[in-house]
Interface confidence: medium
């Protein structure tokens, strides 16, 4: 029977800068029941607080709801593991919510083949930002990436769309069925998951000639 091993805070994520969750991995339990607590303070302050919500994020997590989330402050947190034989602490983790945003995937992905008479045909792709993100405040800049491929192909073709929420693609293989997906990323944060795939059949008479 031993004191617990050192826990490790391995991830923090926020869907929108308004709430966030951090997760830890327990160390060895030393063969005894072990209790875990996450404590934190804000940079420049000495007052320590305990995790406000150990439930919402699932096992070995701490969730910070709206009332506990400040955008312009750095949180300094650590996890304490305790059993009858002693305690151990994780390394301190510094968290500024700006740097942990991982949005939900973009919504309402629409794909259409456009064949104007006077110009080249193209694939028109349009989407909406995820609902939890409020772009009107100016706090957020979302960048988008599109990927597409013929249904049976192994390799994805990737296009960076910048801040646009629509995109045109000119070079496609006629007669093929394509999968199209989009994802988004805030300026300092993480890429979202890819949106569910939308399928589009490219007509056989779709021509890439001038």
């Amino acid at each position: 029977q031993l004191p617990p091993g050192k826990p490790e805070i391995f991830k923090c994520r926020s869907p929108n800068k308004e709430t966030f969750t951090c997760w830890w991995r327990p160390g060895t339990d030393g063969g005894l029941p072990t209790n875990y607590s996450l404590t934190y303070h804000r940079e420049g302050e000495t007052l320590m607080h305990e995790c406000p919500d150990y439930i919402t994020g699932g096992p070995n997590s701490c969730h910070f709801g709206k009332q506990y989330t400040s955008m312009w402050r750095t949180y300094i947190m650590m996890v304490n593991a305790t059993n009858q034989m002693g305690s151990s602490f994780s390394d301190e983790l510094y968290v500024d919510v700006t740097y942990i945003v991982q949005p939900d995937p973009p919504l309402e992905l629409a794909v259409e083949v456009k064949q104007p008479e006077d110009r080249k045909p193209y694939l028109w792709i349009k989407w909406s930002p995820p609902t939890l993100i409020d772009l009107k405040t100016g706090w957020f800049t979302l960048l988008y990436e599109i990927r597409l491929k013929p249904e049976k192909a192994a390799e994805w073709e990737i296009h960076f769309a910048g801040q646009q929420t629509e995109f045109k693609i000119l070079s496609l293989h006629p007669g093929q069925k394509y999968l199209v997906q989009v994802r988004c990323k805030p300026d300092h944060g993480y890429w979202s998951a890819w949106s569910p795939a939308t399928f589009i059949q490219i007509p056989s008479d779709f021509t890439m000639n001038d």
Epitope: I9, F10, T74, D91, V95, D96, Y99, Y190
Partner: antibody, heavy 123, light 110 residues
């Protein structure tokens, strides 16, 4: 406990290539930025390159830009440095270093280091 | 190129207090934190001070760090023979998008 074990060093001719590996254990490799730092014989430390936790962001020192490529395989807990067009001035001990988890600006440092692998570029 | 400036050498007698300086610019020390490493002969560097003044567990409180403007310093009090090593300061440089080191200071315990 955290362990970083470099391999792949050796003697190579100018203009040649070498691929260094760093096997990591004792921590959640996929959560951390990782870096390469080198030290020429009898000289100081020089940062070479860093890669983000997911592998999507990479940064290089000007002295190696366009010649070296950093990458990682999170499924194998391994960091790589592909070194092409090697020059005599690339001769050094190459250290693999872990960057602590920190989600804020201006915090960048190296909390664990491997023992290093020697790369000698000479004809 | 060495971006942060350190004195090449420093020395002191056992029990003495020694200070090593590190000078940078607004794009590194001026806007980011400073870290210090100790490299004993023939070994890999070891983190000594992080975020200007924090000590990792296991580092004695004889070692302390401070930062002011675009300069930082490492102080070692109660100098011991085992402190004889090379000491490097390091920061992040926002304009280079990378890490920068000082040239190192060789500390001799007389």
């Amino acid at each position: 406990q955290v362990e970083l074990l470099e391999s792949g060093g050796g003697l190579v001719q100018p203009g040649g290539s070498l691929r260094l590996s760093c096997a990591a254990s004792g921590f959640t490799f996929s959560s951390y930025w990782m870096s390469w730092v080198r030290q020429a014989p009898g000289k100081g430390l020089e940062w070479v390159s860093s890669v983000s936790d997911t592998g999507t962001d990479t940064h290089y020192a000007d002295s190696v830009k366009g010649r070296f490529t950093i990458s990682r395989d999170n499924s194998k807990n391994t960091l790589y440095l592909q070194m092409n067009s090697l020059r005599a001035e690339d001769t050094a001990v190459y250290y693999c270093a872990k960057t602590p988890l920190a989600y804020s600006s201006g915090w960048y440092y190296f909390d664990y280091w491997g023992q290093g692998t020697l790369v000698t570029v000479s004809s | 190129d060495i971006v942060l400036t350190q004195p090449p050498s420093a020395s002191g007698t056992p029990g003495q207090r020694v200070t090593i300086s590190c000078s940078g610019s607004s794009s590194n020390i001026g806007s980011n934190t400073v870290n210090w490493y100790q490299q004993l002969p023939g070994t890999a560097p070891k983190l000594l001070i992080y975020r200007n003044y924090q000590r990792p567990s296991g580092v004695p409180d004889r070692f302390s760090g401070s930062k002011s403007g675009t300069s930082a310093s490492l102080a070692i009090s109660g100098l011991r023979s085992e402190d004889e090593a090379d000491y490097y300061c390091q920061s992040y440089d926002s304009s280079l998008s990378g890490s920068v080191f000082g040239g190192g200071t060789k500390l001799t315990v007389l």
